[in-house]
């Protein structure tokens, strides 16, 4: 059930060469008229009203790339990954003593690295754990009423509805919407058994619920997860959202007065993970072979034999825990109030070597290397770099989302990119990436500069790579940054075409990881080089490395999708003229900004600040202003979820062609109008001051 379905890329990162470069250059100093807070910290810098950038020797891209590469060469990643897998830090479920132990270790390391400032945010959040007394249980109820125990699973699914259900059991493959639609039998009133993978647990449960299933069992089948241990337990969560589901849309700082509230993404049915052995025991009582197209092992069966039922008892309980997010910042030299955030999940239900150990090790090493580059090597990043260690990631990016919720109104004006380090090393064959289109150009440049750790070829092998990039998924910590906060985000991994089989299990150990990836240090080095080059490019250059022109092609492909429905739209007496106009305005705004940039005096920090401020707002303005962040947190019209998204609008139109009685025309009219005005809003924001906007629209 891991989430890196990013774009496949055969190649990768080893040594990034890079020749030296001398000479002077220019470095900007950013004026600010008032004290500003680094989100979650105070970091005001009142500055002199200044003229142009002072001419001082400046490290260039080649120098920095080489410095980073040299540091990477002498860094022991595996030692740190192994250290994080030691008993004092394992297992480290969110809020546990061992999670706190590791938090303190990270905090101390940040201090030792001499980051400009190190701090922590404390949150009180509700998670769901197994009851210490009552056991979760799966049982077969025979026709004569006899109970045949199947399993009292060691694993569980957080945020399941704690209840007891009985009914028929049917298989629904991965539990995708398509899987449910293609079943030859009804799941109404039945429990469903689904295999892990393809989509998140939360989506599986939501889909099952929408088809009126009464409960869900999740297991790892042998084909997708070729694990020898058939009794291996599995953990996950079922919240169709991120953050603390009991404080939706607002942060759970201790001083917040919580109104009683809960996320609409919590399931109304019980869900439980079971081992493969338990699943096979159930299949022994079931009939009907699973379709060949499922590509599933032969033990799979479709429906429980007549006159038998399955009983699922889930006794999970809510628990309030204290979590710590640990932060360290390297303060920027020019625009310290603008920052890139590099983050990694710290907690894990099991040992979490691949799930949170690698990311945390990368986070620590990157913090150390960049601090070193500043203190010893003369690197002067224009913008700040925040390193963040999140807790409760295993419960739906809780720590990260709580931080975002705490600073929702201002964060997008300050944090301009999020780089996710979670699960960055799961294999070696492919380099996969998911990101905001604003980062595609940066990603491409990086892939042209980083070599694959095993093949030695540059990661950039396919000029068409961007068209294969998959959307960030709900279980990726980068998702709330992009879809909730409107901050461009990127997540990447070195991984295989197959899922890493031990995520969310007690076998996610350093021992298994190094066995599966003997070149672990090299691969971790490559992952660090990718992230490191992102950081340098995003903080060093005078102009912000966010390619706002990339959304032109996204808008164009949306228009193409809509064009298929020209007749339907005309039949409703509607026109796409205004949408075309809004898209055209966006295109013109991007062209104008590019011209402004080319004509700008690069050494004039006021002009550059104004241009960068316009660029920084692009992603945020793709958040629909017409829905409430509390009811529909993922407001991004491209990457979010809900009726305000462009994909929902297209789906609604498809429904008109498929089943006109199910089509909601009023909803569609709203969707079209609001999408038009959201896109127009982005164009206006990019155009700059109000008097520069052509209001003939």
């Amino acid at each position: 059930h891991h989430h890196h379905h990013h774009h496949h890329h055969h190649s990768g990162g080893g040594g990034s060469g890079g020749g030296g470069s001398g000479g002077g250059g220019s470095k900007g100093v950013e004026p600010k008229t008032e004290s500003e807070r680094l989100a979650g910290t105070e970091s005001p810098v009142r500055e002199e009203p200044g003229e142009d950038f002072p001419a001082a020797r400046r490290l260039y891209w080649d120098d920095l790339k080489r410095k980073l590469s040299e540091k990477l060469d002498s860094t022991d990643f595996t030692g740190t990954i192994k250290l994080l897998n030691e008993n004092s830090y394992v297992p480290r479920e969110a809020g546990s003593q061992k999670d706190e132990n590791l938090a303190l270790y990270v905090e101390n390391q940040f201090r030792e690295f001499k980051l400009s400032k190190v701090w922590r945010d404390q949150h009180f959040v509700k998670i769901q754990v197994k009851d210490s007394i009552g056991q979760n249980m799966v049982t077969i109820v025979q026709s004569n009423g006899n109970l045949d125990p199947v399993e009292s699973p060691e694993g569980y699914v957080a945020f399941s509805k704690p209840t007891e259900v009985s009914g028929k059991l049917v298989h629904a493959n991965f539990g995708t919407k398509k899987d449910f639609e293609e079943l030859s039998y009804s799941v109404n009133g039945s429990l469903v058994i689904v295999r892990a993978g393809e989509i998140t647990f939360a989506e599986k449960v939501a889909n099952a619920q929408s088809f009126n299933a009464i409960g869900v069992l999740i297991y790892m089948d042998k084909n997708k997860f070729p694990v020898v241990e058939a009794d291996l337990a599995l953990f996950g969560h079922a919240h169709l959202g991120t953050g603390d589901p009991y404080t939706p849309g607002f942060p759970s700082f201790n001083h917040t007065q919580f109104p009683p509230s809960q996320s609409s993404g919590l399931p109304n049915i019980p869900v439980q993970t079971i081992s493969r052995a338990a699943a096979e025991k159930l299949f022994g009582k079931m009939e009907g072979s699973c379709p060949a197209r499922w590509n599933i092992d032969s033990s799979c069966k479709l429906e429980l034999s007549q006159n038998q039922n399955v009983k699922l008892i889930v006794k999970n309980v809510l628990k309030e825990i204290k979590i710590l997010n640990i932060f360290g910042v390297i303060k920027g030299f020019v625009e310290p109030d603008h920052y890139v955030v590099v983050g990694a999940q710290r907690d894990a239900w099991g040992p979490g070597a691949a799930k949170s150990g690698v990311g945390t090790a990368l986070l620590l090493k990157l913090a150390q290397m960049f601090s070193d580059m500043v203190l010893k090597d003369g690197f002067q990043p224009s913008r700040s770099i925040i390193f963040a260690s999140w807790s409760a990631g295993d419960f739906g990016s809780v720590g990260a989302t709580e931080w975002l919720e705490g600073y929702l109104s201002s964060l997008h004006l300050k944090a301009f990119t999020y780089i996710n380090l979670d699960k960055a090393v799961l294999g070696t064959s492919n380099f996969k990436v998911s990101a905001s289109p604003l980062l595609y150009t940066l990603i491409e440049k990086t892939m042209q500069n980083v070599k694959h750790p095993v093949t030695g070829q540059f990661l950039y092998q396919d000029s068409n790579w961007a068209s294969k990039v998959e959307k960030l998924t709900l279980d990726n910590a980068a998702f709330p940054f992009l879809a909730y906060s409107g901050i461009p985000a990127v997540s990447f991994c070195f991984c295989e075409d197959t899922d890493y089989p031990y995520l969310g299990t007690t076998m996610d150990t350093y021992k298994e990881l190094i066995e599966r990836i003997p070149e672990l240090n090299k691969v971790a080095r490559a992952a660090a080089e990718v992230a490191g080059q992102f950081v340098i490019k995003l903080t060093h250059d005078v102009e912000l490395n966010l390619d706002y022109e990339m959304y032109n092609s996204k808008l164009l492909s949306f228009m193409k999708d809509l064009n298929q429905f020209k007749t339907d739209i005309r039949d409703m007496g509607l026109s796409l003229q205004w949408l075309y106009s809004a898209r055209g305005d966006y295109f013109r705004a991007t062209s104008r900004l590019t011209t402004d940039f080319h004509n700008a005096e690069k050494t004039n920090r006021f002009v550059m600040r104004e241009i960068n401020d316009r660029i920084m707002k692009v992603e945020y303005h793709f958040l629909s202003p017409y829905v409430s962040p509390r009811e529909s947190p993922f407001r991004h019209i491209f990457w979010g979820s809900g009726s305000h998204t462009l994909s929902a609008l297209v789906e609604n139109l498809k429904l008109r062609q498929k089943n006109i009685t199910a089509f909601n025309e009023t909803l569609f009219r709203n969707q079209l109008a609001l999408a038009t005005w959201t896109i127009q809003g982005v164009a206006n924001a990019l155009s700059g001051d109000i008097w520069n906007i052509d209001n003939e629209f």
């Epitope: 030792e112 400009s116 002067q380």
Partner: antibody, heavy 118, light 106 residues
Framework: QVQLQQSGAELVRPGTSVKISCKAS????????LGWVKQRPGHGLEWIGD????????YYNEKFKGKATLTADKSSSTAYMQLSSLASEDSAVYFC???????????WGQGTSVTVSS | ENVLTQSPAIMSASPGEKVTMTCSAS?????MNWYQQKSSTFPKLWIY???KLASGVPGRFSGSGSGKFYSLTISSMEAEDVATYYC?????????FGSGTKLEIK
């Protein structure tokens, strides 16, 4: 409350060594950098170097490499600075100071006077 | 090394007068700290991260600046402000202090 207690004044011969101490209390000794600063009579302040007692990681001002050696004893929460091959220009008051965020030296010892004289 | 030049070296001000002293660095820094030292005592942290006042420092003090140029200002001089003020950078090794500005009262 945070306190840094330094050892007493030293009168030493040229060419010899001296080891001055700085005992920390009131905070987690292993979690903060501890720096050393030199001040000659009537002169300004000079940063000598610092130590992170949790790992014994040290940084030195190039100018003081070979002259100063920084160590720390976790069990007694005490930091030490040994000055070797002493000469008259080493006569100064030496301060230890704890460093927090933004490398702000927020707590200081009272200073140890070292006089090098034959 | 990053040389910090403080000016003036010595200055005197009348009570109630506004006082500004500067610190210029030979290369950019991302923040500046200031210390106050009165004769025969250890230095005290006075301003950190360019503009934040250390605990117990009167509100008449302020700090500002960026890049290579920083300043400490006293809005209204008082007798107890007589001291030597040192700027300090921790942005790159070796960390360095300025030569100090000695503030006297007229």
């Amino acid at each position: 409350q945070v306190q840094l207690q330094q050892s007493g004044a030293e009168l030493v011969r040229p060419g010899t060594s001296v080891k001055i101490s700085c005992k920390a209390s009131g905070y987690a000794f292993t979690n903060y950098w501890l720096g050393w600063v030199k001040q000659r009579p009537g002169h300004g302040l000079e940063w000598i170097g610092d130590i992170f007692p949790g790992s014994d990681n040290t940084y030195y001002n190039e100018k003081f490499k070979g002259k100063a050696t920084l160590t720390a004893d976790k069990s007694s929460s005490t930091a030490y600075m040994q000055l070797s091959s002493l000469a008259s220009e080493d006569s100064a008051v030496y301060f230890c100071a704890r460093s927090g965020n933004f490398y702000a030296m927020d707590y200081w010892g009272q200073g140890t006077s070292v006089t090098v004289s034959s | 090394e990053n040389v910090l030049t403080q000016s003036p070296a010595i200055m005197s001000a009348s009570p109630g007068e506004k006082v500004t002293m500067t610190c210029s660095a030979s290369s950019s820094v991302n923040y500046m700290n200031w210390y106050q030292q009165k004769s025969s005592t250890f230095p005290k942290l006075w301003i950190y991260d360019t503009s934040k006042l250390a605990s117990g420092v009167p509100g008449r003090f302020s700090g500002s600046g960026s890049g290579k140029f920083y300043s400490l200002t006293i809005s209204s001089m008082e007798a107890e402000d007589v001291a030597t003020y040192y700027c300090f950078q921790g942005s790159g090794y070796p960390f360095t202090f300025g030569s100090g500005t000695k503030l006297e009262i007229k």
